[in-house]
């Protein structure tokens, strides 16, 4: 089936926005006013995954770029990266597992759990302008809760 996608931005629970930091990295920082135009717009695609009544599998691409967030092992540690793909073949309904995140909604906040690495989540640091990463803890120092803003 044709994959259904929507455009959105994400902010962490501290209201930090996500921006590009170099060609293959995202960072989280507070933005205001015109600077908000720097934030990345995601193309969130609803894909096949181990869907449950609480978890919706999605892929997170960067709008108008052939880049997707993916989860891989680097030095034996689950790691978040931006991966370049062939735009002729992506997005697709049947994404490879490394591209899939389980979108979990709790109390109007969203978490994004890696399908490849259960219990690892898209995370930001408390500190400003630090890279977005894959973290293995919830409810600790690092932030795993996000809000989503729809973009037309």
């Amino acid at each position: 089936a044709p994959v259904r996608s929507l455009h959105c931005t994400l902010r962490d629970a501290q209201l930090k926005s996500l921006v590009m930091s170099g060609p293959y990295e995202l960072k989280a920082l507070h933005l205001q006013g015109q600077d908000l135009e720097q934030q990345v717009v995601f193309s969130m695609s609803f894909v096949q995954g181990e869907e449950s009544n609480d978890k919706i599998p999605v892929a997170l691409g960067l709008k108008a770029k052939n880049l997707y967030l993916s989860c891989v092992l680097k030095d034996d540690k689950p790691t978040l990266q931006l991966e370049s793909v062939d735009p002729k073949n992506y997005p697709k309904k049947k994404m490879e597992k490394r591209f899939v995140f389980n979108k979990i909604e709790i109390n109007n906040k969203l978490e994004f759990e890696s399908a490849q690495f259960p219990n690892w989540y898209i995370s930001t640091s408390q500190a400003e302008s630090m890279p977005v990463f894959l973290g293995g803890t919830r409810g600790g120092q690092d932030i795993t809760d996000f809000t989503m803003q729809f973009v037309s």
């Epitope: 089936a1 096949q48 995954g49 181990e50 449950s52 597992k97």
Partner: antibody, heavy 122, light 107 residues
């Protein structure tokens, strides 16, 4: 060789809870999902829900409030519990293995158990 | 949810006949259609999995075609052991949904 076998009481009283077990061999429950399907006598197939390798569950909406699927990986067993049963829940209940092939066929079902008939009657 | 419309609900045919069953889905499911055969007192047996793929050990007289919303299952030359009930199943999205079944009887 992949095998699934359903077991449980063949007779359940109305308003009680129907409990079934699916014992599997030839594959690991931590790697593959298992679905439950039922078939009322002389009727078609109805998909009830599934449990994934990681333990997450998906329940079909009409039964969501009454259905619980759980598993014990070490015993290679998946269980189904359906509460507050009525005569309409009389059916042959099947468990089936999901293909769970990422990027190809995640949701298809390839191997089925023989099924067990459950009658709801007082 | 994806609704399935399978037809006909029953069919009488003779050994050697060519038989066709159709399944129409309410949403585009790409090629994620499966076909099962069920005999009385037995569980359904997967004949053809998504992508119109014949399962190992299934005779080549069984075939399927289609993508999107329109799907066809064909038995090219009916054999006595083929008289059974056939079901389509979409595996594109949850909840999984079956067609109503086609009972194939001897004419």
């Amino acid at each position: 060789e992949v095998q699934l076998q359903e077991s449980g009481p063949g007779l359940v009283k109305p308003s009680e809870t129907l409990s079934l077990t699916c014992t599997v061999s030839g594959f690991s429950l931590s790697d593959y999902g298992v679905s439950w399907i039922r078939q009322p006598p002389g009727k078609g197939l109805e998909w009830l829900g599934l449990i994934w390798g990681g333990g997450d569950t998906y329940y079909n909406s009409p039964l969501k409030s009454r259905l619980t699927i759980s598993k014990d990986n070490s015993k290679s067993q998946v269980s189904l519990k359906l509460s507050s049963v009525t005569a309409a829940d009389t059916a042959v209940y099947y468990c089936a293995k999901q293909r769970t092939l990422w990027g190809y066929d995640l949701y298809g079902m390839d191997y089925w158990g023989q099924g067990t008939l459950v009658t709801v009657s007082s | 949810d994806t609704q399935m419309t399978q037809s006909p609900s029953s069919l009488s045919a003779s050994v050697g006949d060519r038989v066709t069953i159709t399944c129409i889905t309410s949403t585009d499911i790409d090629v994620d259609m499966n076909w099962y055969q069920q005999k009385p007192g037995k569980p359904p047996k997967l004949l053809i999995s998504q992508g119109n793929t014949l399962r190992p050990g299934v005779p080549s007289r069984f075939s399927s075609s289609g993508s999107g919303t329109d799907f066809t299952f064909t038995i090219s030359s009916l054999q006595p052991e083929d008289f059974a009930t056939y079901y389509c199943l979409q595996s594109d999205n949850l909840p999984l949904t079956f067609g109503q079944g086609t009972k194939l009887e001897i004419k």
